[in-house]
């Protein structure tokens, strides 16, 4: 006999995990067999929708791979034309393991500002979010809070907040961890120890000391009367984010010296400054004691060696400085007539630059000595044998003139170019032609293999000799 449809197994609420299978069962008794249709949120599910499988004459609805958007009310309706259609409804609750949809990223922040590390999550039940710093759970306090969104907010960021962070999302189905991110706290440059002012005698050495800190570690520059320091040696050391800079000065004039500590924060810089004054006791005294003056070289002996129109230091301890220094060079050059062709041009360059030192004009004209390394090269590479003889004669007082003692500089007492490239003078390039190289210095016993370029012989104004046998 015909029988109206009756749903014998009403639909129940189904819990399903994302990407898993979910099945609703709608068992119907009727005669004839009913047509069963399914809806989700009152919208008909089409039979040919490939995300679903409908079996057992429509009594089983299977969602093949649950998505988080599949949650809602599912209803089955049975109708066979006998009596009215019947309906049963049930809910699909999509359960989801925690997922971090917006993970935290590395952050660089300046001390004192507010930092926010994002951590947006998904999941059902809604995940709770906590944070780990280093290896330990992060404790919230008046400055540090986990927001409703899961993000971490840090007010008034401190140096100790720097470190590695990760967020943890947790619900009954599982736990998700973000990747580890770094919070770097940058600190404006700050001077810890300012240079001290000094009142010193003319010609004394003074060391100015400046210590600064910051993150990143600042660089220290020194300014002399508004310009970059042009003389003096700077020694720096860095320890535990503190930079220590010492400027050693040879005082020939008063000045204002400023230590500037600078560090960079992204595209911006922060600077801190501290200044010290150097005053000279009886500042007028150096004028009386001034040992010389600057003038263009007008002699003959060193014409080929010194640069054209070179400004040289003339020593006023001689009655006639130009005449005396020229005689000094002349005497020394006569001694050089007997030295080897390898040594002679180098020695001539050294002597001329030593006796007629380059001059730095100013309130107090200052002679610029030859750089130690150039002196050593002449002494040890070009003129090893001759130098020993010269030193021996000097010590035994065999030179005719006392003035000749000045003609051999003591290399070890000269300033190094590494200390301050502007505080000493380089010798002109020394360069030989192949034919000049008959002998090698005594420094090495084995004859080295050499590429000697063809070079023009030296011309009038700039003297140019150097041992092609010596690279270093």
């Amino acid at each position: 006999l015909p029988k109206a449809p009756v749903i014998t197994t009403p639909l129940e609420t189904v819990d399903a995990l994302v990407e898993e299978v979910a099945t609703f069962m709608c068992a119907v008794e009727s005669y004839p067999q009913p047509e069963i249709s399914w809806t989700r949120n009152k919208i008909l599910i089409k039979l040919f929708d490939t995300r679903y499988s409908i079996r057992e004459n429509g009594q089983l609805l299977t969602i093949l791979s649950v998505e988080d958007s599949d949650d809602g009310i599912y209803c089955c309706t049975a109708n066979n034309g006998v009596g009215g259609a019947v309906e049963s409804c049930g809910a699909l609750q999509v359960k989801m393991k925690p997922k971090i949809t917006r993970p935290p990223i590395n952050v660089k922040i300046i001390e004192g500002l507010k930092a926010v590390l994002p951590c947006t999550t998904m999941g059902n039940p809604k995940p709770s979010v906590s944070w780990i710093k280093g290896d330990s759970p992060l404790r919230e306090n008046s400055r540090i809070a986990v927001l409703e969104s899961g993000s971490l907010r840090i007010h008034n960021v401190q140096k100790e907040d720097a470190g590695q962070y990760r967020c943890v999302a947790k619900n009954s189905l599982g736990t998700a961890y973000s990747k580890v991110v770094k919070l770097e706290v940058e600190v404006f440059a700050r001077i810890l120890r300012a240079p001290e002012s000094h009142n010193v005698t003319f010609g004394s050495f003074v060391t100015l000391h400046c210590t600064a800190t910051g993150i990143p570690v600042p660089t220290i520059t020194w300014i002399e009367n508004g310009n970059a320091v042009s003389s003096g040696s700077i020694q720096e050391s860095v320890k535990d984010r503190v930079i220590d800079s010492r400027l050693q000065l040879f005082i020939t004039k008063p000045g204002l010296y400023t230590c500037i500590a600078t560090n960079k924060h992204g595209e911006k810089f922060s600077t801190a400054k501290a200044a010290a004054t150097i005053s000279i006791a009886e500042w007028s005294k150096p004028q009386k004691d001034n040992k010389g003056y600057c003038a263009q070289y007008r002699g003959e002996v060193c014409n080929a060696v010194l640069a054209k129109d070179a400004l040289v230091f003339l020593n006023t301890s001689y009655a006639d400085p130009e005449e005396a220094q020229e005689l000094l060079v002349h005497t020394a050059w006569n001694e050089l007539k007997v030295v080897s062709p390898v040594c002679r041009p180098a020695a001539e360059a050294l002597l001329c630059n030593h006796i007629f030192q380059e001059c730095s004009p100013g309130v107090v004209p200052t002679p610029i000595p030859i750089c130690r390394e150039y002196c050593l090269a002449v002494k040890e590479l070009f003129c090893a044998k001759e130098w020993l003889v010269m030193e021996e004669k000097t010590h035994r007082g065999l030179y005719r003139s006392e003035m000749h003692l000045l003609s051999v500089p003591e290399c070890s007492k000269l300033p190094s170019m590494h200390w301050d490239p502007t505080a000493c003078a380089r010798l002109p390039h020394l360069d030989y032609n192949k034919e000049n190289l008959k002998t090698f210095p005594p420094m090495t016993s084995s004859k080295p293999s050499v590429d000697i370029p063809n070079l023009p012989s030296s011309s009038s104004s700039s003297f140019s000799v150097s041992p092609t046998y010596s690279m270093t």
Epitope: R372, E373, Y374, L376, A377, E380, L381, F382, A384, S416, M417, H418, R426, L427, H429, L430, D431, F440, P441, P442, M443, T444, S445, P448, S449, V450, D451, I452, P453, L455, S466, P467, T468, Y469, S470, M471, T472
Partner: antibody, heavy 124, light 107 residues
Framework: EVQLVESGGGLVQPGGSLRLSCAAS????????IHWVRQAPGKGLEWVAS????????SYADSVKGRFTISADTSKNTAYLQMNSLRAEDTAVYYC?????????????????WGQGTLVTVSS | DIQMTQSPSSLSASVGDRVTITCRAS??????VAWYQQKPGKAPKLLIY???SLYSGVPSRFSGSRSGTDFTLTISSLQPEDFATYYC?????????FGQGTKVEIK
């Protein structure tokens, strides 16, 4: 800021060739001497070659003479080491370094700046 | 060729110790001798040049000296950051040679 950056290292078969580059910044190659120094795995430092490009003067260690060529392109501020007929014993990290001044005086300054090194592996 | 014989090849020392490393040249050399410090995986760093001059930025506990063909590097009071390998280097006429290195280890 003075910087030296080496490149061109890699794996090469015995008998093969490689060209190492040393790009300089913060100073001019023409006013300095440039040197190549190598260090085999677990071993000490070995000087390879030097150039004073203001004169184009070069020198080489006996172990590489005739196989390696050092050169410099002052317009690119770069030094090069062309390595031919490579052998297994050439396997090393190759550093370029600079020293102040021209060739006859540079030794007194020491090698004050070095690159990070580039690894050359010679193996079949 | 000039050989630079460095000794000892390794040494163990404690923080605060005075450490001396020597390089002997096989024949007369110039004072173009330098000392370097190298840490694993890093390029060498210049400490001393011209046999006895301290390079800029290097702590004053490092010093170099010369006696004939013997060159010495001294660390007056060893610090934790000084544990490394040290090399001497002589720059002769067209020939540059390094010592074989001295590894300074923590005792």
């Amino acid at each position: 800021e003075v910087q030296l950056v080496e490149s061109g290292g890699g794996l090469v078969q015995p008998g093969g060739s490689l060209r190492l580059s040393c790009a300089a910044s913060g100073f001019t190659v023409s006013s300095s001497s440039i040197h190549w120094v190598r260090q085999a795995p677990g071993k000490g430092l070995e000087w390879v070659a030097s150039i004073s490009s203001s004169y184009g003067s070069t020198s080489y260690a006996d172990s590489v003479k005739g196989r390696f060529t050092i050169s410099a392109d002052t317009s690119k501020n770069t030094a090069y080491l062309q390595m031919n007929s490579l052998r297994a014993e050439d396997t090393a990290v190759y550093y370029c370094a600079r020293s102040e001044g021209d060739r006859y005086v540079s030794g007194y300054f020491g090698f004050d700046y070095w690159g990070q090194g580039t690894l050359v592996t010679v193996s079949s | 060729d000039i050989q630079m014989t460095q000794s000892p090849s390794s040494l163990s020392a404690s923080v605060g110790d005075r450490v001396t490393i020597t390089c002997r040249a096989s024949q007369s050399v110039s004072s173009a001798v330098a000392w370097y410090q190298q840490k694993p995986g890093k390029a060498p760093k210049l400490l001393i040049y011209s046999a006895s001059s301290l390079y800029s930025g290097v702590p004053s506990r490092f010093s170099g000296s010369r006696s004939g063909t013997d060159f010495t590097l001294t660390i007056s009071s060893l610090q934790p950051e000084d544990f490394a390998t040290y090399y001497c280097q002589q720059s002769g006429v067209w020939l540059i040679t390094f010592g074989q290195g001295t590894k300074v280890e923590i005792k």
